[in-house]
């Protein structure tokens, strides 16, 4: 392993998964590295092998149990180390005392569906996946709608500052194809970040009735 600029970032999905990304400038692609997890108040230790995701970036998932099991709490601390093989020994390349509920990134929302669609509006609902019951209602959402001829990056963000798993999109154009995405973030945690965007939901508004004003 080389002493280039490094970055080690991990997130807890609030249930039973810690996902980590390790990057290092100038590191060799075939370097053998792993993440080792050592909790302060649990009987398990966990290791996952870092697998290449790009030229100088590796990732792995520490799977702590069944997807919906609550494996860590707000008082847990898990010491995470990146260990890379150097000859016959392992070298500590990065270390952190990981506080799961300070470093949250939930799974992308799922089960998006059109509840009701009209000419100018559409009501959409979704569900959150593998989210801890600890959050109660302390979640927020961002949503975006892809209009014809635009990119996702150009789509304005709609913010829902509460746990509201539906939205009514208005001022839509009749008989037009749209796509919709949503993401979620807990309010808790200094280093918490947004979930990935959901899979896009495609929908089409109803055509305007003939002879009516649009």
């Amino acid at each position: 392993a080389v002493n280039g600029t490094s970055q080690f970032t991990c997130f807890y999905n609030s249930r039973a998964n810690i996902s980590c990304v390790w990057s290092q400038d100038g590191a060799l692609q075939d370097t053998s590295c792993q993440v080792h997890a050592w909790p302060d108040r649990r009987r398990w230790n966990q290791t996952c092998e870092l697998l290449p995701v790009s030229q100088a970036s590796w990732a792995c998932n520490l799977i702590l149990g069944a997807p919906d099991s609550q494996k860590l709490t707000t008082v847990d601390i898990v010491t995470l180390r990146v260990l890379c093989r150097e000859g016959v020994r392992w070298r500590v390349m990065a270390i952190q005392d990981f506080k799961p509920f300070e470093n949250l990134r939930l799974m992308a929302p799922i089960s998006l569906q059109v509840v009701h669609v009209e000419t100018h509006r559409c009501n959409i609902s979704w569900e959150i996946s593998q989210a801890s019951h600890y959050f109660e209602r302390h979640l927020e959402f961002e949503a975006r709608t892809l209009s014809p001829g635009h990119t996702w990056e150009e789509a304005p963000l709609l913010t829902l500052k509460q746990k509201q798993e539906w939205i009514c999109l208005e001022t839509l154009t009749p008989d037009t194809q749209y796509e919709f995405q949503v993401r979620v973030k807990p309010l808790q945690g200094e280093f918490t970040t947004w979930s990935p965007w959901s899979q896009p939901l495609a929908f089409r508004t109803k055509p305007a009735a003939l002879g009516k004003d649009t």
Partner: nanobody
């Protein structure tokens, strides 16, 4: 704003001990890795030791290993450096430094430091 205030330096004879303290404020101390660095007269800044945010991991420069001990009290927002068997070569201004996250990188311990204090002078001389 982030504030780091070192204390505990002074004049000590070779073989003696000192305990440095660093009082931290302006950020959630328990969420960040910390370190001690030092600068001897006319020399570059030198890394001494680092500690993880909850104190479960520590690393030391070879020059101080076995003599210095880094620790922290997250309830008191204070970082410590216990220095034993002091040598004249340990004479320097000692700075407490904050990392930009909970992570530090032992092979490149200078990486990611974003704040340091004003320092406290340690002089080892007979």
């Amino acid at each position: 704003q982030v504030q780091l205030v070192e204390s505990g330096g002074g004049l000590v004879q070779p073989g003696g001990s000192l305990r440095l303290s660093c009082a931290a404020s302006g950020f959630t101390f328990s969420n960040y890795a910390m370190s001690w660095v030092r600068q001897a007269p006319g020399k570059e800044l030198e890394w001494v030791s680092s500690i993880t945010s909850a104190g479960r991991g520590t690393h030391y420069a070879d020059t101080v290993k076995g003599r210095f001990t880094i620790s922290r009290d997250n309830d008191e927002n204070t970082l410590y450096l216990q220095m034993n068997s002091l040598e004249p070569e340990d004479t320097a201004v000692y700075y407490c430094a904050k990392y930009s996250s909970a992570t530090y990188y032992p092979p490149t311990p200078a990486q990611g430091r974003d704040y340091r204090g004003q320092g406290t002078q340690v002089t080892v001389s007979s």
